[in-house]
């Protein structure tokens, strides 16, 4: 028997990805980060 139509059993959460670069002084270079949902992960 064919399956009746239903949505997938899991929910997709859409999150904003924000790349940022911060200048921390001429002798320390720059920090480049990736923020996902408010948490810096890289």
């Amino acid at each position: 028997d064919a399956e009746f139509r239903h949505d997938s059993g899991y929910e997709v959460h859409h999150q904003k990805l924000v790349f940022f670069a911060e200048d921390v002084g001429s002798n320390k270079g720059a920090i480049i980060g990736l923020m996902v949902g408010g948490v810096v992960i890289a």
């Epitope: 028997d1 064919a2 399956e3 009746f4 139509r5 239903h6 949505d7 997938s8 059993g9 899991y10 929910e11």
Partner: antibody, heavy 123, light 112 residues
Framework: QVTLKESGPGILKPSQTLSLTCSLS??????????VGWFRQPSGKGLEWLAH???????SYNPSLKSRLTISKYTSRNQVFLTITSVDTADTATYYC???????????????WGQGTSVTVSS | DVLMTQTPLSLPVSLGDQASISCRSS???????????LEWYLQKPGQSPKLLIY???NRFSGVPDRFSGSGSGTDFTLKISRVEAEDLGVYYC?????????FGAGTKLELK
């Protein structure tokens, strides 16, 4: 509030085409995930699923009756239709429509039913 | 087609009793999305069916907590902890996972 109301001819003769209408209120057929199905129940007997139509015009039919069934909708009028060709006395039943909405925030079950319309096929 | 077998077909009870209705499907009704679309409906005389339980064990809005659903795979149960007069009628199990969608034959809950 959410309501569904079936209407039909009441009585028709064998070999004729049965046309049923389900009029919806309190919700929109254009809402993503929304669907309406048709069911029937001969007097004193059990329930049988006939067909279902979704907001995006996807349709599903009971294979045992598929050759005789056509489900369709008129979204702007919030109506769903079912036609059954070449009716016989075995098609005598109360016909119900019910809504079923897809989606993870929906219960995905027949949560509201119409009161039914009685159809008799007799020569 | 998935055959839904309900037992018993008739269930005489006294008010306040616990009632239990069994429903067995002829094959698994676990959908590929991980959900089992097993539902219970109550139909009172002269009325349309009303949803009680969906996805095996979830009570629909407004359904008293004396109703509970359980099961998995092919075996499912509806329990009514303390039967009230308004609970009398015919109970149908239903599977919404596979085409054609199918109902059990119904269980008539009636007074002894």
């Amino acid at each position: 509030q959410v309501t569904l109301k079936e209407s039909g001819p009441g009585i028709l003769k064998p070999s004729q085409t049965l046309s049923l209408t389900c009029s919806l209120s309190g919700f929109s057929l254009s809402t993503s995930g929304m669907g309406v199905g048709w069911f029937r129940q001969p007097s004193g007997k059990g329930l049988e699923w006939l067909a279902h139509i979704w907001w995006d015009d996807d349709k599903s039919y009971n294979p045992s009756l598929k050759s005789r069934l056509t489900i369709s909708k008129y979204t702007s009028r919030n109506q769903v239709f079912l036609t059954i060709t070449s009716v016989d006395t075995a098609d005598t039943a109360t016909y119900y429509c019910a809504r079923r909405q897809l989606g993870l925030r929906s219960i995905d079950a027949m949560d509201y039913w119409g009161q039914g319309t009685s159809v008799t096929v007799s020569s | 087609d998935v055959l839904m077998t309900q037992t018993p077909l008739s269930l005489p009870v006294s008010l306040g009793d616990q009632a239990s209705i069994s429903c067995r499907s002829s094959q698994s009704i676990l959908h590929s999305n991980g959900n089992t679309y097993l539902e219970w409906y109550l139909q009172k005389p002269g009325q349309s069916p009303k949803l009680l339980i969906y996805k095996v064990s979830n009570r629909f809005s407004g359904v008293p907590d004396r109703f509970s659903g359980s099961g998995s795979g092919t075996d499912f149960t509806l329990k009514i902890s303390r039967v009230e007069a308004e609970d009398l009628g015919v109970y149908y199990c239903f599977q919404g996972s596979l085409v054609p969608l199918t109902f059990g034959a119904g269980t008539k809950l009636e007074l002894k």
